[in-house]
Amino acid sequence: QDSRGCARWCPQDSSCVNATACRCNPGFSSFSEIITTPMETCDDINECATLSKVSCGKFSDCWNTEGSYDCVCSPGYEPVSGAKTFKNESENTCQDVDECQQNPRLCKSYGTCVNTLGSYTCQCLPGFKLKPEDPKLCTDVNECTSGQNPCHSSTHCLNNVGSYQCRCRPGWQPIPGSPNGPNNTVCEDVDECSSGQHQCDSSTVCFNTVGSYSCRCRPGWKPRHGIPNNQKDTVCEDMTFSTWTPPPGVHSQTLSRFFDKVQDLGRDYKPGLANNTIQSILQALDELLEAPGDLETLPRLQQHCVASHLLDGLEDVLRGLSKNLSNGLLNFSYPAGTELSLEVQKQVDRSVTLRQNQAVMQLDWNQAQKSGDPGPSVVGLVSIPGMGKLLAEAPLVLEPEKQMLLHETHQGLLQDGSPILLSDVISAFLSNNDTQNLSSPVTFTFSHRSVIPRQKVLCVFWEHGQNGCGHWATTGCSTIGTRDTSTICRCTHLSSFAVLMAHYDVQEEDPVLTVIT
């Protein structure tokens, strides 16, 4: 005890009353109002507790402190008086703070600040929404992936910041009267081919596809080495000539010179040169067959191989070249009798007749074109009388049943063997190279030299054998009728044709004379 009679043992946050008692300081309380033992403590009174008599008033919060309390304006409010703290409702001057005015960038981009009592909210602009993890941040709404499908199916949706566009897909354009961008955009396919917006090489033909286009090799052309067909960057080369080279194993200067000419014509060939090129090839062939030179010294079999090779190649080359001709009828004839008749048309539904000096061909136009082939329809007939020299003594191979029929009703082949070629050799071709089984037959009328009485006349075609040579055959060809100097043949395929006179001893009254082979 001190000399003034004040207890020295008073607990923290208390003051002595006298030498034996203490009292808690204001803002603190103990179990009993007067403290008489040092074991008692003074605890802070929470003036802000619910049952407390302290009232700070509206828009404010009570903050308890050690031994006291403070009233402060709630977040979003501030005191008009400027005093940061106060003690009771009567001192409360708290009013709402307009955060939006205080900080115009509060809602960052794409949002509008809206003041609320004690706070603010961000209202997002159209095309934006509040980010869940940051409700004050507006982020772009991706209308394209939100499942709203705001665009027409002919367009594709492009998300923009705060918006979206419905744009025509590549290779499409707005239909007449439609915008390109708004959600009411409707598009249609652009035909790049007819509008000239394509970049196809001159060696190709442009094909429109939905939303795009492709470049396909012209008929008779092939993709350049290593470049695929049917692409936008396809470049092609003419293949009409590349495969028509001398047959292997045949050594003939005359033939080599012919093929040199063919290769020369092919080297700088262009589609516009088709007419001149056809004429030049036939001119060269006519000259070759008029003066075969050392070809005539070759063994017969080799001559047949050369003829086979010439007929086969000529057909391919003429088919390829004629696809580049303009519509119309062409007739060319050459000094040694070679003759070409050609008709080129956009497909028409009628029959076509090609007339030549020694042959007439009649067939249905719709055979000419392969379905899906964009080029013109071509029907061609070449008469090659000079080919007869190379085909002398060429064998005739009959189907077993025809062979049997002839042997039963005739005396059989006479000893001198090989049939005689009565007519010019003709070659028929179409733009469609699939001519092995025509849906309607082709009719040929041949003019030829006189038939020796009691000899069998046969309509034949040249069958290219596996060995690169060939023989005369009758499969698919029938003799419709024959007079002394003309014969009508009907065939279900195209190739090179002729009329042969076979050395059968036919009995004059023999009814088999009228049998169609």
Partner: antibody, heavy 118, light 106 residues
């Protein structure tokens, strides 16, 4: 009838360029190559190159590669030849001619005289 | 390139005479053409494809040959035939002309 009409005579300084024209008529312009040939005074014929009007494809002799440019305008059926970096030895008569491998050059223009002199 | 050598370079002849000139190629040629040129005029195609006479060319002119050797012949010289004759090939690029044979009056 087939005609090839060439532009008039030109006088140029060394280093300059000249562009000659050859207007075709009487045939389908795209069905033949257009050849360009020159002939220096007292000399023989020298091929420069050829252009195919159908697709603009060109062929040049090595000597003129990069210095001569052959073009064709199908809308006017006119072929052009431009020769750059002219030298005095380019003084010659320049001819255009219609050509095809098997037929040779069957029609010729009347020729354009180009004189290169300082 | 294929070099065409014409011989002779100059040929003197009299009207009525038979004249032959040749064109030799450094490699085989399949299409050979011949042109006639008179002073101050453009050349004219005279013979094409070795032996075919161009339109309007008299039949006293003829051509022959194959491979590397070609010949141009005038069976009976006429006064209007005096000119320079050129051979030409386009069997391979570049197209080439021979140096010409000048046919002059003896």
């Amino acid at each position: 009838q087939v005609q090839l009409q060439q532009s008039g005579a030109e006088v140029k300084k060394p280093g300059a360029s000249v562009k000659l024209s050859c207007k075709a008529s009487g045939y389908t312009f795209t069905n033949y190559w257009m050849q360009w040939i020159r002939q220096a005074p007292g000399q023989g014929l020298e091929w420069i190159g050829a252009v195919y009007p159908g697709d603009g494809d060109t062929r040049y002799t090595q000597k003129f590669q990069g210095r001569a440019t052959l073009t064709a305008d199908t809308s006017t059926s006119t072929a052009y030849m431009e020769v750059s970096s002219l030298r005095s030895e380019d003084t010659a008569v320049y001819y255009c001619a219609r050509g095809f491998t098997a037929y040779g050059m069957d029609y010729w223009g009347q020729g354009t005289t180009v004189t290169v002199s300082s | 390139e294929i070099v065409l050598t014409q011989s002779p370079a100059t040929l003197s002849a009299s009207p009525g005479e038979r004249v032959t000139m040749s064109c030799s190629a450094s490699s085989s040629v399949s299409y050979m053409h011949w042109y006639q040129q008179k002073p101050g005029l453009a050349p004219r195609r005279w013979i094409y494809d070795t032996s075919k006479l161009a339109s309007g060319v008299p039949d006293r002119f003829s051509g022959s040959g194959s491979g590397t050797d070609y010949t141009f012949t005038i069976s009976r010289m006429e006064p209007e035939d005096f000119a320079t004759y050129y051979c030409q090939q386009w069997s391979s690029n570049p197209l080439t002309f021979g140096g010409g044979t000048k046919l002059e009056i003896k």
